[in-house]
């Protein structure tokens, strides 16, 4: 069946260039009219970038001409999109899409890769505990969690009592700071009667930092 | 360019209903428009191009119609695996915009948020830095304001939130905002409060805790 | 954990009647029009009726109305879908749903 299989997404500082691959299995690939798109954090799609079966014709959105360049190597069945002059809002997920036939619509998808324009350097996080108090009880809830702050890139990932706590969890998508450095929170509600026998631990994985942190969570000791 | 806009932005639905999104373009197309679904995390799948022909494997519950500047995309019994955003895209010219999107949700009722507020803690004042987050748990519907006051007087331009993704299993949203100060800044007030606006409230609710008190 | 229970499916024969039952959790149950679809041998997943949060508003798929009956006991968090005067036709597994989630389904078999 028809795959194609992105590759070269990654971390790169403003200005610099990235090159992306899509590679196509499952069809004749020099038949076929691909296109780039891309996503923005939270936001819609946008058209990209198209080159025709032949090579003969090469079309780019306004936002990216004269920076991007999109070629094909037909004998390795894979399409490429050169990135020059890189910009922070160039931060997206690129997918390839290949058209149906002869009609320009996106009948296949790649699975997409990040591209993530910044001039911050790989940095884990900070775990701090948000502990429950009076201020965080309602009815006979309590609500406790963790600041996961200044880290890059992103993704990391938030369990609670290694896994073994799922209900009641919140972790929410990071936010990027003005310092370019994300920060999340993850929080749990839990009974309030268990804040004095049951620990709390959120267990925070940052992969490109090589970070792990184990942080318990027990109410604030006056 | 020919522009596309979609309507709604954003859609609630329950299961079974019948619900329609518009898409509209700035010139005629004729019927050079492909409708897409798409999944938090994933690729956009094709459900419909030519305006009203539907991709193989689509559900026929999908229906595509118009021509020129105006179509519609409608699910005629919307079913759990519907719940997605949807994009229009027109292939009439070089440029293949699409529209800016129709988030489909699922459609609750009014749930008011819980309220909790976290001061810092001593470890991350040692850092030199204090964040004050406000939680706001479970409420739907997803519309909700937080103002931060610190010692009464309104903040703005030092705050950030994030909410999540509808809730699976409740349909319900939750929210955090976090105030970032320098510790110095921190250090100069005694009252951090956090006043909550929702539908689900009758009146504004306000968390809010004393510097340096337990 | 499971947030949509179905059960109540069986083998009947045509002109009979069976009561499927969908227990839910209470959050769901509370807030959320819930439905029934059913998918028979080879066809779509296909709408069959569905109940508003309070109990106010009932569809129904037009060849089943006057045969099946939708309803919720808001003491046990249970929608029932009653079917009355049961075809071959009818022949399908039923599943229920409310929000993102779906029941496991319950077949139903009508012999003629």
């Known amino acids: 069946q028809v795959q194609l299989v992105q590759s070269g997404g990654g971390v790169v500082q403003p200005g610099r260039s990235l090159r992306l691959s899509c590679a196509a299995s499952g069809f004749t690939f020099s038949r076929y009219t691909i296109h780039w798109v891309r996503q923005a954090p939270g936001k819609g799609l946008e058209w990209v970038a198209v080159m025709s079966y032949n090579g003969n014709n090469k079309h780019y959105a306004d936002s990216v001409n004269g920076r991007f360049t999109i070629s094909r190597n037909d004998s390795k069945n894979t399409l490429y999109l050169n990135m020059n002059s890189l910009r922070p809002e160039d931060t997206a997920v690129y997918y390839c899409a290949r058209i149906r036939d002869t009609a320009m619509f996106f009948a296949h998808w790649g699975q997409g890769t990040l591209v993530t324009v910044s001039s911050a350097s790989t940095k884990g996080p900070s775990v701090f505990p948000l502990a429950p108090s009076s201020k965080s009880t309602s009815g006979g809830t309590a609500a406790l969690g963790c600041l996961v702050k200044d880290y890059f890139p992103e993704p990391v990932t938030v369990s609670w009592n290694s896994g073994a706590l799922t209900s009641g969890v919140h972790t929410f998508p990071a936010v990027l700071q003005s310092s370019g450095l994300y920060s999340l929170s993850s929080v749990v509600t839990v009974p309030s009667s268990s804040l004095g026998t049951q620990t709390y631990i959120c267990n925070v994985n940052h992969k490109p930092s090589n970070t792990k942190v184990d942080k318990k969570v027990e109410p604030k000791s006056c | 360019d020919i522009q596309m806009t979609q309507s709604p932005s954003t859609l609630s639905a329950s299961v079974g209903d019948r619900v329609t999104i518009t898409c509209r373009a700035s010139q005629s197309i004729n019927t050079w428009l492909a409708w897409y679904q798409q999944k938090p995390g994933k690729a956009p799948k094709l459900l419909m191009y030519k305006a009203s022909s539907l991709e193989s494997g689509v559900p026929s519950r999908f229906i595509g119609s118009g021509s020129g500047t105006e179509f519609t995309l409608t699910i005629s019994s919307l079913q759990p695996d519907d719940f997605a955003t949807y994009y229009c895209q027109q292939y009439n010219s070089d440029s293949k915009m699409f529209g800016q999107g129709t988030k489909v949700e699922v459609k609750g009722t009014v749930a008011a948020p819980s309220v909790f507020i976290f001061p810092p803690s001593d470890e991350q004042l040692k850092s030199g830095t204090a964040s004050v987050v406000c939680l706001l748990n479970n409420f739907y519907p997803r519309e909700a304001k937080v103002q931060w006051k610190v010692d009464n007087a309104l903040q703005s331009g030092n705050s950030q939130e994030s909410v999540t993704e509808q809730d699976s299993k409740d349909s319900t949203y939750s929210l955090s905002s976090t105030l970032t100060l320098s510790k110095a800044d921190y250090e100069k007030h005694k009252v951090y409060a956090c006043e909550v606006t929702h539908q689900g409230l009758s009146s504004p609710v306000t968390k809010s805790f004393n510097r340096g008190e337990c | 954990q499971v947030q949509l229970q179905d059960s109540g499916g069986g083998l009947v024969q045509a002109g009979g009647s069976l009561r499927l039952s969908c227990a839910a959790s209470?959050?769901?149950?509370?807030?959320?029009?819930m439905a029934w679809f059913r998918q028979a041998p080879g066809q779509e997943r296909e709408f069959v009726s569905s109940i508003s949060w309070n109990g106010a508003v009932t569809n129904y798929l037009d060849s089943v109305k006057g045969r099946f009956t939708i309803s919720k006991d808001n003491a046990k968090n249970t929608v029932y879908l009653q079917m009355n005067s049961l075809k071959p036709e009818d022949t399908a597994v039923y599943y229920c749903a409310a929000g993102r989630n779906w029941g496991q389904g319950t077949q139903v078999t009508v012999s003629s």
């Open positions: 209470g959050r769901i149950f509370s807030t959320h029009t």
